[in-house]
């Protein structure tokens, strides 16, 4: 969490941002909140990006003002206009690109004064893994697949029964470049699995960590997966 304050002159207002990550090809949110004002027409929101000449986005007098927007963001940004009055200056970024990563500034002017806060925005690809029993294999084998990751992640297997065991010798992981030549499909195979055990396939890069669990018993198979973004710090 980053909390920024206005500098000298008039009064300062508190602006708060949260570091976040964007999944390339999808839409992302850059979070920013501020002390609200009574009149929408008195609020100006400007989003800036380090190393970029033009603005990322500007909202003033109750509407978008995009005449000074940098071309790399043209047609890709929006604020939540109906939430500005309650202090939400978050930016929606469409079709996140790898090059959108960097330091952004949420800069706010209201009748009370001005304030700003920076946020770090990481970009990459991350997806939920799915773990299945591979019935085609000659021995009891699990197959963990996740369709889109970037940068290349690490894959670690774990088991509830053999806690702390190292499965690197009995697993094999491959990365296959997807058609857009950036993201990769992750496939990891675990051999010699035993029944009545829960196995976890953990995929992690510097942006996200995802886990796919599978519990195999004689009567059923249970699956569960979850994904967590890393380094979500507020400012």
């Amino acid at each position: 969490l980053i909390i920024g304050f206005g500098i000298s002159g008039r009064h300062s207002i508190t602006v708060t941002t949260v570091a976040s990550a964007g999944n390339i090809g999808e839409d992302g949110i850059l979070s920013c909140t501020f002390e609200p004002d009574i009149k929408l027409s008195d609020i100006v929101i400007q989003w800036l990006k380090e190393g970029v000449l033009g603005l990322v986005h500007e909202f003033k007098e109750g509407k978008d003002e995009l005449s000074e927007q940098d071309e790399m963001f043209r047609g890709r940004t929006a604020v939540f206009a109906d939430q500005v009055i309650v202090g939400n200056a978050s930016l929606r970024l469409k079709n996140v690109q790898l090059t959108d990563a960097g330091t952004y500034k949420c800069y706010i002017i209201t009748s009370k004064g001005k304030g700003n806060a920076n946020l770090e925005y990481k970009t990459g690809a991350f997806s939920m893994p799915e773990v299945n029993v591979d019935y085609n294999a000659s021995s009891e084998t699990l197959r963990c697949e996740a369709p889109r990751w970037f940068p290349q992640p690490t894959v670690v297997w774990a088991s509830q029964v053999d806690q702390g065991a190292n499965f690197s010798e009995v697993s094999n992981t491959s990365f296959e470049l997807n058609s857009e030549n950036v993201t990769m499909k992750v496939v990891s195979v675990l051999y010699n699995v035993t029944i009545n055990n829960t196995y976890s396939c953990m995929i992690e890069n510097d942006i996200a960590k995802a886990t796919g669990d599978i519990k195999v018993t004689e009567s059923e198979i249970k699956r569960r997966s979850h994904l967590q973004l890393l380094n979500s710090k507020a400012s």
């Epitope: 500098i7 002159g9 400007q46 800036l48 190393g51 603005l55 330091t103 800069y107």
Partner: antibody, heavy 123, light 112 residues
């Protein structure tokens, strides 16, 4: 297009003063600090001062305190630098430059520069 | 004031050569917040300076990838992998970690 348009060359007498202007276009004038930089003939660059156009707040290089005075006119998106008690040492090209993105006060790099105003002090 | 020392002051090159310019500061440029505020500019003859690299190694938008910056503490380097005609001019390093902001004397990149 983002531009900083500076006023034309000045030939002034020793002891006189001069006011150099810098008009910004293509970006929100009050969002970025405006800096002034001196370049003496064939020499390096010296930072003079900056002004925050939002509130008129200034910060000066100690060396130029009493020599330069910065002001802005928000309505015309124009920054001014007034130089007084001019001597031959003040003959130089003076640039206005927009601050790049800043994290606090420190990332004082300049991403847009004016073309420069030549000030010649001579009798 | 922090003194910025650039070497060499003049660098004769042929087009296509790699060029390397050094910049040394009289004190560390690592700010207490962790960032290092060392920047590079190019001033072509008769023009104002233009920003190339900010905060040691970040290329400014539109700057070709043949330009790269590196270094830490007090020692910094600007490299041009293959010099083109449009790269000729005077290169300045600048620090903004300490007030007042200061510039190096400049390195003139010229044809042999």
């Amino acid at each position: 297009e983002i531009q900083l348009q500076q006023s034309g060359p000045e030939l002034v007498m020793p002891g006189a003063s001069v006011k150099v202007s810098c008009t910004a276009s293509g970006y929100p004038f009050t969002t970025y600090n405006m800096y002034w930089v001196k370049q003496s003939h064939g020499k390096s660059l010296e930072w003079i001062a900056y002004i925050d156009p939002y509130n008129g707040g200034t910060s000066y290089n100690q060396k130029f305190k009493g020599k330069a005075t910065l002001t802005v006119d928000k309505s015309s998106s124009t920054a001014y630098m007034h130089l007084n008690s001019l001597t031959s040492e003040d003959s130089a090209v003076y640039y206005c430059a927009r601050s790049g993105f800043y994290d606090g006060y420190y990332a004082w790099y300049f991403d847009v520069w004016g073309a420069g105003t030549t000030v010649t002090v001579s009798s | 004031d922090v003194v910025m020392t650039q070497t060499p002051l003049s660098l004769p090159v042929s087009l296509g050569d790699q060029a390397s310019i050094s910049c040394r500061s009289s004190q560390s440029l690592v700010h207490s917040g962790g960032n290092t505020y060392l920047h590079w500019y190019l001033q072509k003859p008769g023009q104002s300076p233009k920003l190339l690299i900010y905060k040691v190694s970040n290329r400014f938008s539109g700057v070709p990838d043949r330009f790269s910056g590196s270094g830490s503490g007090t020692d910094f380097t600007l490299k041009i992998s293959r010099v083109e005609a449009e790269d000729l001019g005077v290169y300045f390093c600048s620090q903004s970690t300490h007030v007042p902001l200061t510039f190096g004397a400049g390195t003139k990149l010229e044809l042999k």
